[in-house]
């Protein structure tokens, strides 16, 4: 019964970019300006997203797809579909409630977003520090001593087998 009704429903013939207009005997009417329908059989069109203020338009709204926003220079997207814009900081800084603050000693941030992370402790892996860390860059750990001894093989060991669906690092 449900299937029969859907086949007889004139609204199911309305393509994306239109809506089924109840006020006009269920005729398929084009979406009004600044609205869209991304699927067929819609009884209303959705209002287009407007990229205002710190948001800027990455993709214009069309009758079949919503507008897409990104952030103005000096800001970066957060959240699904760029639902928020967050202020950029410089490398070597992190964003706090009081604004951008330099990374504390022993931490770094090599991006304009995100938080300061601790320098790698090379000795935990039996390695030594080749280059000291900075606010903008992690330390560089050298190879393990075994890799440096006479007769150490230059051949890179094969990567361990990975389960299907796992991407390499």
């Amino acid at each position: 019964f449900e299937r029969t009704r859907s086949l007889q429903d004139p609204c199911s013939n309305c393509p994306a970019g239109t809506f089924c207009d109840n006020n006009r005997n269920q005729i398929c009417s084009p979406c009004p300006p600044n609205s869209f329908s991304s699927a067929g059989g819609q009884r209303t069109c959705d209002i287009c997203r407007q990229c205002k203020g710190v948001f800027r338009t990455r993709k214009e709204c069309s009758s079949t797809s919503n507008a897409e926003c990104d952030c103005t220079p000096g800001f970066h997207c957060l959240g699904a579909g760029c639902s928020m814009c967050e202020q950029d900081c410089k490398q070597g800084q992190e964003l706090t409630k009081k604004g951008c603050k330099d990374c504390c000693f022993g931490t770094f941030n090599d991006q304009k977003r995100g938080i300061c992370r601790p320098w790698t402790n090379c000795s935990l892996d039996g390695k030594s520090v080749l280059v000291n860390g900075t606010k903008e860059r992690d330390v560089v750990c050298g190879p393990s001593p075994a890799d440096l001894s006479p007769g150490a093989s230059s051949v890179t060991p094969p990567a361990p087998a990975r389960e299907p669906g796992h991407s390499p690092q």
Partner: nanobody, 116 residues
Framework: QVQLVESGGGLVQAGGSLRLSCAAS????????MAWYRQAPGKQRELVAL???????KYADSVKGRFTISRDDTKNTVDLEMNSLKPEDTAVYTC??????????WGQGTQVTVSS
């Protein structure tokens, strides 16, 4: 892990020059540093030069002012320009990709021989 292939080694007279090149099979940008090491027969492998992702460089004292390391992240290559070569520079030169969180990736090495 990337695969690394070196080229440019060979026999050269003292005072001459060579340019070694290291080609990586994948992106080198995410590595903490790219480096050249060398190993003479019976000796420990030693760091010659390294370059970090932000292009900070470090050189062994014995090669400062003579060797220059550079990288091209678009081509995934690391070069070592070697000038004023000395007999004591004779060794197998190996490219390395240094990643703090994993084992070092090594190339197979290329022989450099400096005759007097």
């Amino acid at each position: 892990q990337v695969q690394l292939v070196e080229s440019g080694g060979g026999l050269v007279q003292a005072g001459g020059s060579l340019r070694l090149s290291c080609a990586a099979s994948g992106s080198i940008f995410s590595y903490n540093a790219m480096a050249w090491y060398r190993q003479a027969p019976g000796k420990q492998r030693e760091l010659v030069a390294l370059i970090t992702s932000d292009r900070t460089t470090k050189y062994a004292d014995s090669v400062k002012g003579r060797f220059t390391i550079s990288r091209d992240d678009t081509k995934n290559t690391v070069d070592l320009e070697m000038n004023s070569l000395k007999p004591e520079d004779t060794a197998v030169y190996t490219c390395a990709a240094l990643l703090n969180s994993a084992r070092t990736s090594w190339g197979q090495g290329t022989q450099v021989t400096v005759s007097s």
